[in-house]
Interface confidence: medium
């Protein structure tokens, strides 16, 4: 029977800069029941606070709701593991909410084959930003990436769409069924997961781009 091993805060993520969650890995438990607590203070503050919500983010997590989240202050946090034999502390982690944003995937992905009479046919892809992101405030710039491939192909073709929420693709294989997905990331932060795949059948008479 030993004191617990050193825990590690390994990930913090925010869906929208308004809330965030951090997760830790427990160290060895020393063969005894172990309690974990996360304490934090914000840069420039003297008061130490305990995690406001250990439930929302699941096991070994701390969730900071709206009223505990400040974009303008670095959070300095640490996890304490305690059992009957003693305690151990994680290293301090410095967290700036601006840099841990990982949005939800874009929504309402729509894909359509357009065959104008006067121009070459193209695949038109359109989507919406994730609902939790408020782009009107100007706090966010979301960048988008599209990937597509024929259903049976192994390799994805990736296109960077910038800040657009629609995109045209000209070079496609006629008669093939394509999978299309889109993801987004803030200017500072992490790529979202890919959106659920949308399938589109390319007509056999679709003319390849020169």
């Amino acid at each position: 029977q030993l004191p617990p091993g050193k825990p590690e805060i390994f990930k913090c993520r925010s869906p929208n800069k308004e809330t965030f969650t951090c997760w830790w890995r427990p160290g060895t438990d020393g063969g005894l029941p172990t309690n974990y607590s996360l304490t934090y203070h914000r840069e420039g503050e003297t008061l130490m606070h305990e995690c406001p919500d250990y439930i929302t983010g699941g096991p070994n997590s701390c969730h900071f709701g709206k009223q505990y989240t400040s974009m303008w202050r670095t959070y300095i946090m640490m996890v304490n593991a305690t059992n009957q034999m003693g305690s151990s502390f994680s290293d301090e982690l410095y967290v700036d909410v601006t840099y841990i944003v990982q949005p939800d995937p874009p929504l309402e992905l729509a894909v359509e084959v357009k065959q104008p009479e006067d121009r070459k046919p193209y695949l038109w892809i359109k989507w919406s930003p994730p609902t939790l992101i408020d782009l009107k405030t100007g706090w966010f710039t979301l960048l988008y990436e599209i990937r597509l491939k024929p259903e049976k192909a192994a390799e994805w073709e990736i296109h960077f769409a910038g800040q657009q929420t629609e995109f045209k693709i000209l070079s496609l294989h006629p008669g093939q069924k394509y999978l299309v997905q889109v993801r987004c990331k803030p200017d500072h932060g992490y790529w979202s997961a890919w959106s659920p795949a949308t399938f589109i059948q390319i007509p056999s008479d679709f003319t390849m781009n020169d």
Epitope: G44, L47, H49, Q67, T69, W72, R73
Partner: antibody
Framework: EVQLLESGGGLVQPGGSLRLSCAAS????????MSWVRQVPGKGLEWVSL????????YYADSVKGRFTISRDNSKNTLYLQMNSLRAEDTAVYYC?????????????WGQGTLVTV | QSVLTQPPSASGTPGQRVTISCSGS????????VYWYQQLPGTAPKLLIY???KRPSGVPDRFSGSKSGTSASLAISGLRSEDEADYYC???????????FGGGTKLTVL
Amino acid sequence: EVQLLESGGGLVQPGGSLRLSCAASGFTFDDYGMSWVRQVPGKGLEWVSLISWDGGSTYYADSVKGRFTISRDNSKNTLYLQMNSLRAEDTAVYYCARPSGAYPTPFDNWGQGTLVTV
Amino acid sequence: QSVLTQPPSASGTPGQRVTISCSGSTSNIGSNYVYWYQQLPGTAPKLLIYDNNKRPSGVPDRFSGSKSGTSASLAISGLRSEDEADYYCAAWDDSLSGWVFGGGTKLTVL
């Protein structure tokens, strides 16, 4: 050292106006939301108003809503409270208070107060 | 009429333990942290307890706070003459979008 210095209090007739100021020093003023809290002499504390770090969000107690306006000038490190349509019940010592962090966190620094008599 | 309810007065002799209660509702104490302030005569309030039960540095461990449901209490053990002051509880109120205070409790050390 954090310092908050209120000024602008005094004697005013019912229906009159007054503007209180709070000069802040010893910390990065525009990192913090700020509040006004008042106290009728010999009575309890009453929160009056709160303003966010950038002035974009303001909150008021029902008792002063529509009559008082909180504002700030981050370039001058100064907080203001414009008080209009003053009533006898507004007579109090007015404290400028700084929270410990992003709201809602408690007030860990207070000024010495300025007395307003209506 | 204060949103949070405290007894107007409390008293004890040196060395005794006294408790001051603070009662609120689900929109304030029930869903937010409770804070306690001490106000010595002629001075501005001072933060005594934060986040229900934590003490800022410099506050003696004779002072302790607790919260249960929509009520909170401040306990002072080993009462001393310098503890004679007014004590206020406070909490953020989600419905009012503002801070609410108790009416204050005047503590007399006999």
